[in-house]
């Protein structure tokens, strides 16, 4: 196999008895993406697969970047918070049991939620064989794979390969269509010697040789262009050091009252379980760990406040206190922990060192192609397409990997709008009531009528503002029974949600400005009722007078209209959103400084922003009754987050509104919190922390969609599968490995 040139078969070349291509899912644990480029000459077989088939620059693991969570994510398409295997070690208060890789408890089906690939295949009449895979020797939903092997790490790799080849030799009626194969390397060697070590180099040669044996065996059976093979890893690997340790004893006078899952992705819970599990004061722990040292190498979070892109909160097994640890550092209880040096993983899945490999080859895959990175939650849908079966519900976005396939099996379409919009029409030039709003600059009713008339756009003006400010179409509302209306302005368009009494979204385009100076200040102390919105559906300005620590923010920044006259279009109740005062500082800095910078760098950006309500922190928009549970003496709900989606043209010679090809996206989902303690901003100017904070909360457009019930880019003329690629793209700014 190795000596031959790449075959370019136009259709599957399967021998007699193989009606449809088998699928082999092959995992090499801890194979970080960088190994593939650094040590390619030492891995001729894997390198040939990379050259001849399709590969991604890397595949993103899910957080925490550990073995069991990611292997099970790959075969379910579910986030760890959804499938339940949230770490290699965990406690479930409902089961009152501990899960670990060294205990038989791991084979209790109660831990394993979701539907793994082998069951999906079997439920649809196909046989499945697993040569090791986390979960494969567990009776999930009462069933095992058709063929499985009890885990035994001492079985030589060659023996594993020859067994799989024997399965391929089975008579057609007994032969599986789906296979898994698992190697512990290069992970074991990476832990022992670190990622840059002779041990890893040796391990890479060993796994490459075994992989070559598989490909040669397929060739001998004339299956090398029949089988669809996916070679991937669960996560990467990074170096750790014994002088890069954070000890909890440096932060607490005593530590015996809590239990800590130590390492690169630490969690803290009560020591006395189950008794103290729910009463444990997680907030106090996070307070005691926040902003304690100038060079602190972890950030403490309550899990609901973690970046939403991690989807690591909604499971009782995820302890409420979480430490987000710097690259190559470890957080542990005390100096008695000497488990350092060598390699480790589990860190932030944006770190380049945590990136995993993905390569694929076979009749269904494109050839000699490199694709952009994607997340491992997408692999399950891809495998279902290869097997031509229906996936179980999962967190992947079906169709987002269609560009890997010669002929896609599943054709996605845009979601149908669920709640139709109306237009909040202009009828009364003078408000029927003030809503307790004041604008001293507007001295009399003539002036008030004059500025209100500016909200009364002609059809031509509406067409013009839509073209510029909604270049990819208005966001469609996928939530049920959401009474909302469109509000058109010359400089922005918004979708006003009557139930929330605030805009659900606001869309505007910031051009590339010759003048990159910060925006001028907003006209002060000037607010008025929007005459287009019924007062009974509006916020009252008096809502913000009470001592609530809450002030009004503007979704569309009024100062974007650089003249005070045009600012009046934005100084209206329909543009108000409730914001904590500390949050607003950051919000205002982003809009007055950073947004101008982005627009300058990208030849203009379209901005869509709005509130998010995710009180139950499940990553999906809350039902109305969930939101109302959290109202305190108000009928204006306080958002849990705000989103901002920046869209520009990939080809920077075009503006967003005239973009013929691919778009570039930069979405943010910023937790709406009463303080900025996450950034330790004391005594620091905004320039030193706001951008870093926004960057920490970058997300996918898809994450924004799930949290808002909105659907973006429906009017962008581009195949839907390409739009889904855009929506599942996560911008990253990590440069060092």
């Amino acid at each position: 196999w190795l000596e031959e040139n790449c075959d370019t078969a136009q259709q599957s070349q399967c021998p007699e008895g193989f009606d449809l291509p088998p699928v082999i899912l092959f995992s090499m644990d801890g194979f970080r993406a960088e190994y593939l480029y650094t040590w390619d000459t030492l891995m001729p077989n894997i390198n040939k697969l990379k050259t001849c088939g399709i590969h991604s620059k890397y595949m993103r693991a899910m957080y925490p970047t550990k073995t069991f969570p990611n292997h099970y994510t790959i075969v379910t398409g579910l986030y760890p918070e959804s499938h339940g295997i949230i770490d290699n070690n965990m406690y479930d208060v409902n089961l009152n049991k501990n899960f670990s890789l060294s205990s038989k408890e791991q084979n209790n089906p109660a831990w394993w939620h979701g539907q793994p690939m082998w069951l999906t295949a079997m439920y649809q009449g196909l046989k499945a064989a697993t040569y090791f895979w986390p979960g494969s020797e567990v009776a999930i939903n009462g069933s095992f794979p058709s063929i499985y092997m009890p885990y035994n790490g001492s079985v030589p790799f060659e023996e594993r390969i020859s067994t799989l080849l024997k399965w391929l030799d089975l008579p057609k009626a007994e032969r599986p269509r789906f296979y898994t194969m698992y190697f512990e390397e290069p992970d074991s060697s990476g832990h022992a010697g670190g990622p840059v070590s002779a041990r890893v180099i040796k391990a890479l040669q060993v796994v490459d040789h075994a992989f070559g044996m598989l490909m040669e065996g397929l060739k001998q059976r004339n299956l090398h262009n029949c089988v669809n093979i996916i070679l991937l890893a669960d996560h990467g690997m990074d170096q750790t050091y014994c002088n890069k340790m954070e000890y909890m004893t440096d932060y607490f006078p005593r530590i015996n009252f809590f239990y800590m899952y130590e390492g690169p992705a630490p969690r803290i819970r009560a020591h006395n379980i189950p008794h103290d599990f729910f009463s444990f004061n997680s907030e106090e722990i996070v307070r005691n760990l926040s902003c304690r040292k100038p060079d602190q190498h972890f950030k403490p979070y309550l899990t609901p406040d973690l970046p939403k892109r991690l989807h690591y909160a909604k499971n009782v097994r995820i302890d409420k206190v979480h430490l987000f640890v710097d690259q190559q550092w470890l957080a542990v209880r005390s100096k008695s922990n000497t488990n350092c040096g060598g390699g480790n993983h589990g860190y932030n899945n944006e770190f380049r060192s945590m990136e995993a490999i993905f390569l694929a080859h076979g009749p269904s895959f494109k050839e000699k192609t490199e694709v952009e990175p994607f997340e491992n939650i997408e692999v399950y849908n891809l495998m279902c397409d290869l097997l031509r079966i229906q996936p179980a519900p999962n967190n992947g976005t079906h169709g987002s990997l269609n560009h890997l396939l010669k002929v896609p099996f599943y054709e996605p379409s845009h979601a149908e709008e669920v709640s139709k919009f109306s237009v909040c029409g202009f009828a009364n030039p003078l408000p029927t009531e003030s809503l307790d709003c004041f604008c001293p600059h507007l001295q009399n009713s003539t002036q008030l009528e004059q500025v209100n008339q500016m909200l009364n756009l002609t059809q031509e003006e509406i067409t013009a503002t839509v073209k510029v400010n909604l270049p990819f179409g208005r966001p469609r509302v996928l939530q049920k029974n959401v009474d909302h209306c469109l509000l058109y302005h010359r400089e922005y368009v918004s979708g006003f949600g009557k139930a929330m009494r605030m805009p659900m979204w606001s869309s505007y385009t910031v051009p590339q400005l010759g003048d990159t100076s910060p925006l001028p200040p907003t006209v002060p102390d000037c607010l008025r009722a929007d005459v287009r919105v019924p007062p009974s559906e509006s916020q009252k300005c008096s809502f913000y007078l009470a001592d609530k620590n809450i002030t009004h923010g503007f979704l569309y920044p009024p100062a974007s209209n650089r003249t005070s006259d045009s600012q009046y279009d934005a100084l209206i109740t329909s543009n108000l959103v409730p914001m904590y005062e500390e949050f607003r500082k950051m919000w205002d800095y982003f809009h007055s400084v950073l947004l101008i910078k982005h627009a300058t760098e990208r030849n203009g950006v379209n901005v869509v922003s709005g509130p998010i309500f995710d009180y139950n922190y499940d990553g999906h928009f809350d039902a109305p009754d969930e939101i109302t549970k959290h109202l305190a003496n108000t009928d204006v709900p306080i958002p849990t987050h705000y989103f901002v989606v920046l869209t520009s043209c990939k080809n920077k010679s075009h503006t967003p509104e005239n973009c013929p090809g691919w778009l570039d996206v930069l979405p943010f989902i910023i937790p709406h919190r009463p303080t900025n303690v996450e950034s330790c901003p004391e005594g620091k100017p905004e320039a030193l922390w706001v951008e870093e904070r926004f960057t920490a909360h970058i997300a996918r457009v898809r994450d924004v969609e799930l949290l808002t019930g909105l659907d973006f880019y429906q009017d962008k003329v581009q195949p839907v599968s390409e739009i889904l690629q855009l929506k599942t793209y996560l911008p990253t700014f990590e440069t060092t490995i």
């Epitope: 009828a427 009364n428 029927t432 019924p534 009974s536 109302t628 305190a632």
Partner: antibody, heavy 120, light 107 residues
């Protein structure tokens, strides 16, 4: 189904405070606006105000200085207090539930009303 | 404030008649108008919400419509149980005002 029942004294002296309670049974007080409406003898309906289950209120400006509407979710009750009453406050007082979504605050469930007379 | 006028203030009709009651508002209030029926000694009952939507359980002979600031309640074929006073109510402003009422009695 949801039922509302007003309770409170039928006779109040001038300058005193009128206090009524509305008990909600057969359903939750959550997610609705709870209103008080009155009807003087032989006259039309006058809206007094509402309280949202979360506690936020909205009052008829003509009564705002004298009226307080509050909610007690634990008891599934809301109440009306009208201070400094005069004979002009004599009326049948109704409590009602207003539904906002798509009902545009339509008052779909009413109590049977209680007559309050202001007299010394 | 939004002023509400109802016409006629009273009308006499026979069973089977088509009856139309009009409510006019001083401002454009979109569809923020509800109609209620009240019988002597009883609490009002919601008939129509959002100008034209029939409240569940209300007979289909009742209908509502809007033309600008004029709102109409129509009873297509008057029944004996329909003799009552009818009120419109606006919920556009934060002060929910009722119209003065229209009394429908037997001719």
């Amino acid at each position: 189904q949801v039922q509302l029942q007003e309770s409170g004294p039928g006779l109040v002296k001038p300058s005193e405070t009128l206090s009524l309670t509305c008990t909600v049974s057969g359903g939750s007080i959550s997610s609705y606006y709870w209103s008080w409406i009155r009807q003087p003898p032989g006259k039309g309906l006058e809206w007094i105000g509402y309280v949202y289950f979360s506690g936020s209120t909205n009052y008829n400006p003509s009564l705002k200085s004298r009226v307080t509407i509050s909610v007690d979710t634990s008891k599934n009750q809301f109440s009306l207090k009208l201070s400094s009453v005069t004979a002009a406050d004599t009326a049948v007082y109704y409590c009602a539930r207003a539904t906002r979504d798509y009902y545009y605050y339509g008052m779909d469930v009413w109590g049977q009303g209680t007559t309050v007379t202001v007299s010394s | 404030d939004i002023q509400m006028t109802q016409s006629p203030s009273s009308l006499s009709a026979s069973v089977g008649d088509r009856v139309t009651i009009t409510c006019r508002t001083s401002h454009d209030i979109s569809n923020y108008l509800n109609w209620y029926q009240q019988k002597p000694g009883k609490a009002p009952k919601l008939l129509i919400y959002a100008a034209s939507s029939l409240q569940s359980g209300v007979p289909s002979r009742f209908s509502g419509s809007r033309s600008g600031t004029d709102f109409t309640l129509t009873i297509s074929s008057l029944q004996p149980e329909d003799f009552a006073t009818y009120y419109c109510q606006q919920t556009y402003s934060t002060l929910f005002t009722f119209g003065p009422g229209t009394k429908v009695d037997i001719k």
